[in-house]
Interface confidence: low
C-alpha cells in the first residue's frame, strides 16, 4: 500500500495473507468459514511452492494469539482467467478446515448486486504489499482510503485505454494506491467487499494509472457455485 498508514490491529478480521513457502505473496479476504477469495494470477507466482493462508494476523513476523496458518485443500481459479489478461482475476482457496472464528477472524459480506459503486465513494484497501517504490515490504498490515473513479475516466487513452471492463472498477491512484503484494486483497466500500485487487504489473501511485479491482458482484454466480 502506497501512501497509506498502519491499520488498526485486527480491525479487519477478514484480511488474509496468501503465503508460499512461508512468505507473503498476495492478499486475500475471508468470504466464508472455509474459503478465502484472492486473485488468480497469484497462483502463477506460486510455482510449485506450498500455498497456505494466514488468518488473524496484524504482524507477519510477530507471534499473535489470533494468528493461524491454514493449509489449502483446494485452489479454484476462475475458469476464464488467463495469464495474459487481468480479466476474471479471481481465485477461491478452500482451507483445510473451517477457520476458527473470533474477534480477529471473521468473513466479510460481499456485494451481490451487480451495480457499480458510485464514483467518488471512499473505499478501504488493505494489504502487506510494498510501501515504497524501492520495494520496501511492511511487517504490519497497511491500509488506505481511495475514491472510486468512474470507468469512463479510467478507460481514457491516457489512463487504461479501454481495458477496464464492466467486471472491473477503478480507484484513484494519486500517490495513494495498492501495489505489488496487495493483489488479491479486498476493496471494501461501506463495510461490504466490492472489489479484489488485480494482480497485473501496473505502475503504482501514478494518477494516470488508476488501481484496477475485480468487481465481486459480477461473479456472484461463480462464487456461489464454488462455495456450494
Amino acid at each position: 500500500i502506497l501512501g497509506g498508514r498502519e491499520a488498526e490491529a485486527h480491525a479487519r478480521p477478514y484480511m488474509a495473507s496468501v503465503q508460499v513457502n512461508g512468505e507473503h505473496l498476495c492478499g486475500g479476504v475471508l468470504v466464508a468459514e472455509q474459503w478465502v477469495l484472492s486473485a488468480a494470477h497469484c497462483l502463477e507466482d506460486a510455482a510449485d511452492g506450498k500455498v497456505q493462508v494466514l488468518l488473524g494476523a496484524h504482524s507477519l513476523s510477530q507471534p499473535e494469539p489470533s494468528k493461524r496458518l491454514y493449509d489449502v485443500l483446494r485452489a479454484v481459479p476462475h475458469p476464464d482467467s488467463r495469464p495474459d489478461t487481468i480479466d476474471h482475476d479471481l481465485l477461491l482457496l478452500q482451507l483445510s478446515e473451517k477457520a476458527t472464528l473470533g474477534p480477529a477472524v471473521r468473513p466479510l459480506p460481499w456485494q451481490r448486486v451487480d451495480r457499480d459503486v458510485e464514483p467518488g465513494t471512499l473505499c478501504d484497501v488493505a494489504g502487506w504489499g510494498i510501501v515504497s517504490h524501492a520495494g520496501r515490504r511492511p511487517d504490519r498490515l497497511q491500509h488506505v482510503l481511495l475514491p472510486v473513479l468512474d470507468r469512463a475516466t479510467c478507460n481514457r487513452r491516457t489512463h487504461h485505454d479501454g481495458a477496464i471492463t464492466q467486471r472491473m472498477m477503478c480507484a484513484e491512484s494519486n500517490r495513494r494506491d495498492s501495489c505489488k503484494g496487495d493483489s488479491g486483497g479486498p476493496l471494501v466500500c461501506g463495510g461490504v467487499l466490492e472489489g479484489v485487487v488485480t494482480s497485473g504489473s501496473r505502475v503504482c501511485g501514478n494518477r494516470k494509472k488508476p488501481g484496477i479491482y475485480t468487481r465481486v458482484a459480477s461473479y456472484a454466480a461463480w462464487i456461489d457455485s464454488v462455495l456450494a
Epitope: D87, D114, R115, Q166, A217, S218, A220, A221
Partner: antibody, heavy 122, light 107 residues
Framework: EVQLQQSGPELVKPGASVKISCKAS????????MNWVKHSPEKSLEWIGD????????TYNQKFKARATLTVDKSSSTAYMQLKSLTSEDSAVYYC???????????????WGQGTLVTVSA | DIVMTQSHKFMSTSVGDRVSITCKAS??????VAWYQQKPGQSPKLLIF???TRHTGVPDRFTGSGSGTDYTLTISSVQAEDLALYYC?????????FGGGTKLEIK
C-alpha cells in the same frame, strides 16, 4: 452510427462447425464487450458468452462453453463465434450484440447485429 | 442460473389501450431487469434497463416497474407499431438470462 454487420446464412451438416462474423463500425471496437445470443423458437433468447475486444478475455455460459469459441480481430473490428459439433438443436438465429453501460454499470444489450441464420441439416 | 418467466405467451389489446406485460425472476434480482422489443423480421431493441430507466429514444408511453422477483412493462396507450415480441432480461449476474417472450397482438 453504431452498426454490427453479420455474415450470411449458413447451411451445415450435423457434426460440423460454423464460424460467424460480426463487423463493428461507428464506435471504438475495444470499448465494449461483444456478446453472442442464440434465438430459437423453442428456447427464446439465450446468452452464449461475451468477449472483451481489448484483451481477448472471454466469459461463457456454461451451457455453451464446451462448443463455442469467441475471438476478435482488432485490426478489422470484427468479432467471431465458432460453434462446433453441431446438431439440429443448434438451428437458430445467432446475434452479436454490444453491451450497454449506464452510470458505468452493464445494463443490457444496446446494439444488435441483423442476425445470422444457421440451419443444421443432413 | 436465474430463470426469467413470462407467464403470458400472447396478449391481445386494442390501439389506445393500456397493457402490462409481466416477468418473474427465480430469485431476487434487485431491480436489475431490462426489457426488449422485437418486431417481425428485426433484431431486438433495448427499451428499458434498471427496471424503469428508458433507453435513448424510447417513447414515454413505455414504463417499467417492479422489485424483488416481480417486474412489469407497461404501455400506457398502445399504438399499432407496438405489435411485437417483448422480452425481459436480468442483468443482475452472469449468465445473463431472458424470459420466453410475450407476443403483443393488436385486435
Amino acid at each position: 452510427e453504431v452498426q454490427l454487420q453479420q455474415s450470411g446464412p449458413e447451411l451445415v451438416k450435423p457434426g460440423a462447425s460454423v464460424k460467424i462474423s460480426c463487423k463493428a463500425s461507428g464506435y471504438s471496437f475495444t470499448a465494449y464487450y461483444m456478446n453472442w445470443v442464440k434465438h430459437s423458437p423453442e428456447k427464446s433468447l439465450e446468452w452464449i458468452g461475451d468477449i472483451n475486444p481489448s484483451t481477448g478475455g472471454t466469459t461463457y455460459n456454461q451451457k455453451f462453453k464446451a462448443r463455442a469459441t469467441l475471438t476478435v480481430d482488432k485490426s478489422s473490428s470484427t468479432a467471431y463465434m465458432q460453434l462446433k459439433s453441431l446438431t439440429s438443436e443448434d438451428s437458430a438465429v445467432y446475434y452479436c450484440a454490444t453491451t450497454y453501460y449506464s452510470g458505468n454499470s452493464y445494463v443490457g444489450f444496446a446494439y444488435w447485429g441483423q442476425g445470422t441464420l444457421v440451419t443444421v441439416s443432413a | 442460473d436465474i430463470v426469467m418467466t413470462q407467464s403470458h405467451k400472447f396478449m391481445s389489446t386494442s390501439v389506445g389501450d393500456r397493457v402490462s406485460i409481466t416477468c418473474k425472476a427465480s430469485q431476487d434480482v434487485s431491480t436489475a431487469v431490462a426489457w426488449y422489443q422485437q418486431k417481425p423480421g428485426q433484431s431486438p431493441k433495448l427499451l428499458i434497463f434498471w427496471t424503469s430507466t428508458r433507453h435513448t429514444g424510447v417513447p414515454d408511453r413505455f414504463t417499467g416497474s417492479g422489485s424483488g422477483t416481480d417486474y412489469t412493462l407497461t404501455i400506457s396507450s398502445v399504438q399499432a407499431e407496438d405489435l411485437a415480441l417483448y422480452y425481459c432480461q436480468q442483468h443482475y449476474t452472469t449468465p445473463w438470462t431472458f424470459g420466453g417472450g410475450t407476443k403483443l397482438e393488436i385486435k
